[in-house]
């Protein structure tokens, strides 16, 4: 049975030419983390593995950093950033845990952090 | 088009160190992916050995790690195989390819090294 | 270590045949798995990785399947080409293992 919960930075927003990062925490349960993925709509972003470590994919390697701990840091945003991404753990013997967060860029400077939320 | 190319001794005594490097030519080691040693075994057996990462960080298969080293030279674009105290055991054919999330997109031609007095 | 069951060893089969070959792994690996084909005297060629996913270039006649722990590669209509050993490899864990190849013969 899955216990599990993932808590994520929920609907946040950053200025376009800033950076912000992505976190997703895994909690209420006692599985092991094998490996995390970071995901942007359909586009596989990175890949954490608990035994390989970080893969970035080539074609976001410019603007994507692994990190803090299992969490992304995106780099240089564009408008085109906007949209949802998914933190999705792997882990043993739950299976796999989904955590969404909504990324919207702003032109301008009010760019504010959404508050924090639950994803069972 | 990326091209990888293996060179190195094709005979090595048993207790030596083997080293191997890994040319590689239209792509920049430093600018993404990983790049990976890999050897086939007489018997068609393909065992992964380890990779640098463009950023230079290293995993090497637990079963060498006593006795691998990968590095790389990025003024040259190169990357390298130091395996020590070989025995004849390590005669094989060793590849160096290019990993993306932990497969291998391109390969090496493969360069067959003999571990013999 | 994860460990990669392929069956069969060997396979004879004519051109124009369908030809299936499997992949059994000691532990669920989700879709993280790539198929490889290398003929003799070459260097492996990627074929498939994620479990399905056709390689740039590959031909369509290959597709690749499963999740978890069992996984197949299929070949309709063989093309004189297609003859060597196929290998499957899992990108899961470290180690990163192969199975022990399936070789493909012209009958």
């Known amino acids: 049975m899955m216990t599990g919960t993932i808590e994520t930075t929920g609907n946040i927003s950053a200025e376009k030419g800033g950076s912000i990062i992505l976190q997703c925490h895994l909690s209420s349960t006692t599985a092991q983390v094998t490996q995390v993925n970071w995901e942007q709509q359909d586009q596989l972003l990175a890949i954490c593995n608990a035994d390989l470590g970080w893969h970035i994919s080539p074609s976001f390697k410019d603007r994507v950093a692994p990190g803090p701990g299992l969490g992304l840091t995106l780099q240089s945003l564009t408008v085109n950033d906007t949209g949802e991404y998914f933190c999705i753990y792997h882990t043993y013997p739950d299976g796999t845990y989904t955590g969404r967060i909504f990324l919207e860029v702003l032109e301008s400077s009010v760019a504010e952090h959404g508050a924090r939320f639950q994803i069972p | 088009d990326v091209q990888l190319q293996e060179s190195g001794p094709g005979l090595v005594k048993p207790s030596q160190s083997l080293s191997l490097t890994c040319t590689v030519t239209?792509?920049?080691?430093?600018?993404?992916y990983d790049w990976h040693w890999i050897r086939l075994f007489p018997g068609h057996i393909l065992e992964w050995m380890g990779y640098i990462s463009y950023s230079g960080n290293t995993i090497y298969n637990p079963s060498l790690k006593s006795r691998i080293s990968i590095t790389h030279d990025t003024s040259k674009n190169h990357f390298f195989l130091k395996l020590n105290s070989v025995t004849t055991e390590d005669t094989a054919t060793y590849y160096c390819a290019r990993g993306s999330f932990w497969y291998f997109d391109v390969w090496g031609a493969g360069t067959t090294v003999t571990v013999s007095s | 270590d994860i460990q990669m069951t392929q069956s069969p060893a060997s396979l004879s089969a004519s051109v124009g045949e369908t030809v299936t070959i499997t992949c059994r792994v000691s532990e669920h690996i989700y879709n993280y798995l790539a198929w490889y084909q290398q003929k003799q005297g070459k260097s492996p060629q990627l074929l498939v990785y994620n479990a399905k996913t056709l390689a740039e270039g590959v031909p369509s006649r290959f597709s690749g399947s499963g999740s978890g722990t069992q996984f197949s590669l299929k070949i309709n209509s063989l093309q004189p080409e297609d003859f060597g050993t196929y290998y499957c490899?899992?990108?899961?864990?470290?180690?990163?293992?192969f199975g022990a190849g399936t070789k493909v013969e012209l009958k």
């Open positions: 239209g792509y920049s080691i430093t600018s993404a």
């Open positions: 490899q899992h990108n899961y864990g470290n180690p990163l293992t």
